[in-house]
């Protein structure tokens, strides 16, 4: 397969509701009509798949399986949102992009986005 450049932000802070969003941008060398995007999480040298989506150019992303991710695509950019994050999910989230059709097949892997998740403090009981 051929290499392709993928850019993503270095750091993102998740919201208090455990939602993190970031843009994954790829430098498409050709006119791809089918694109696959996979988000991988790297922590303690372990790499696990978070979610995966596939889409036809100009159409919306279809996330596979029961996904914690949602997203939209625009040109060579994919806007990804990961939900339900907790402090233990803090880690490096890597965007992998594959141009599946037509050949040649291109593969690009970003450097990763460090997502920091801080669990909200429980509200103290208040007596009035």
């Amino acid at each position: 397969c051929k290499a392709m450049h993928v850019a993503q932000p270095a750091v993102v802070l998740a919201s208090s509701r455990g939602i993190a969003s970031f843009v994954c941008e790829y430098a498409s060398p050709g006119k791809a009509t089918e694109v696959r995007v996979t988000v991988l999480r790297q922590a303690d040298s372990q790499v696990t798949e978070v979610c995966a989506a596939t889409y036809m150019m100009g159409n919306e992303l279809t996330f596979l399986d029961d996904s914690i991710c949602t997203g939209t695509s625009s040109g060579n950019q994919v806007n990804l949102t990961i939900q339900g994050l907790r402090a233990m999910d803090t880690g490096l989230y890597i965007c992998k992009v594959e141009l599946m059709y037509p050949p040649p097949y291109y593969l690009g892997i970003g450097n990763g986005t460090q997502i920091y998740v801080i669990d909200p403090e429980p509200c103290p009981d208040s007596d009035f």
């Epitope: 050709g30 089918e34 798949e49 036809m56 059709y101 037509p102 050949p103 040649p104 593969l107």
Partner: antibody, heavy 123, light 107 residues
Framework: QVKLQESGAELVRPGASVTLSCKAS????????MHWMKQTPVHGLEWIGV????????TYNQKFKGKATLTADKSSSTAYMEFLSLTSEDSAVYYC????????????????WGQGTSVTVSS | DIVMTQTTASLSASVGETVTITCRAS??????LAWYQQKQGRSPQLLVY???TLGDGVPSRFSGSGSGTQYSLKINSLQPEDFGSYYC?????????FGGGTKLEIK
């Protein structure tokens, strides 16, 4: 009906090259990818690579890069695979196969296969 | 590369029996899986794609199931013409590798 007609069996000497052909009929040649497979008793079925006859775009299995060269001739609806510098390891049955219709995310399938070409490398 | 493992290399069964052939992927392939049948000296024939969709003209006694890394092909009420070799193939990331095959023989 869809048919992929492959060329006949080949007996070739080590170090030589061979070109296999696959003539497509019964559908629009440029609307479907053409893939090539290798089958041996030891390694089973292996995916060699794919060519898009419309654009000429190619993806090879890294294992076969430099060993196989894929081409397609739109005018005759024929796909070709040249296999270079043959050794006994290249003795196998080779198949051309068509991948299901383009422009649908889920059509990942080899829906039609040629009858296979047997290649024997021997001195 | 994704490794496809068919742990049962050969299987013997009688006409009328039900058999299940399994295939394991080394990583999640998200149902991007096909099953093929191959008779001796013939080319493979498509049975199932997208893990569970039957190919055109494939009898309903064949069914595919599974998800993630584990997939299976079930054949209900085996017929004489069902004996042969069965292969799984993934379509997740290239190269699109095959399982080693399961040979189904008559008992």
């Amino acid at each position: 009906q869809v048919k992929l007609q492959e060329s006949g069996a080949e007996l070739v000497r080590p170090g030589a090259s061979v070109t296999l052909s696959c003539k497509a009929s019964g559908y629009t040649f440029t609307d479907y990818e053409m893939h090539w497979m290798k089958q041996t008793p030891v390694h089973g079925l292996e995916w060699i690579g794919v060519i898009d006859p419309e654009t000429g775009g190619i993806t090879y299995n890294q294992k076969f890069k430099g060993k196989a060269t894929l081409t397609a001739d739109k005018s005759s609806s024929t796909a070709y695979m040249e296999f270079l510098s043959l050794t006994s390891e290249d003795s196998a049955v080779y198949y051309c196969t068509r991948r299901g219709a383009r422009a649908t995310v889920y059509n990942y399938v080899m829906d039609y296969w040629g009858q296979g070409t047997s290649v024997t490398v021997s001195s | 590369d994704i490794v496809m493992t068919q742990t049962t290399a050969s299987l013997s069964a009688s006409v009328g029996e039900t058999v299940t052939i399994t295939c394991r992927a080394s990583e999640n392939i998200h149902n991007y899986l096909a099953w093929y049948q191959q008779k001796q000296g013939r080319s493979p024939q498509l049975l199932v794609y997208n893990a569970k969709t039957l190919g055109d003209g494939v009898p309903s006694r064949f069914s595919g199931s599974g998800s993630g890394t584990q997939y299976s092909l079930k054949i209900n009420s085996l017929q004489p013409e069902d004996f042969g070799s069965y292969y799984c193939q993934h379509f997740w990331s290239t190269p699109w590798t095959f399982g080693g095959g399961t040979k189904l023989e008559i008992k």
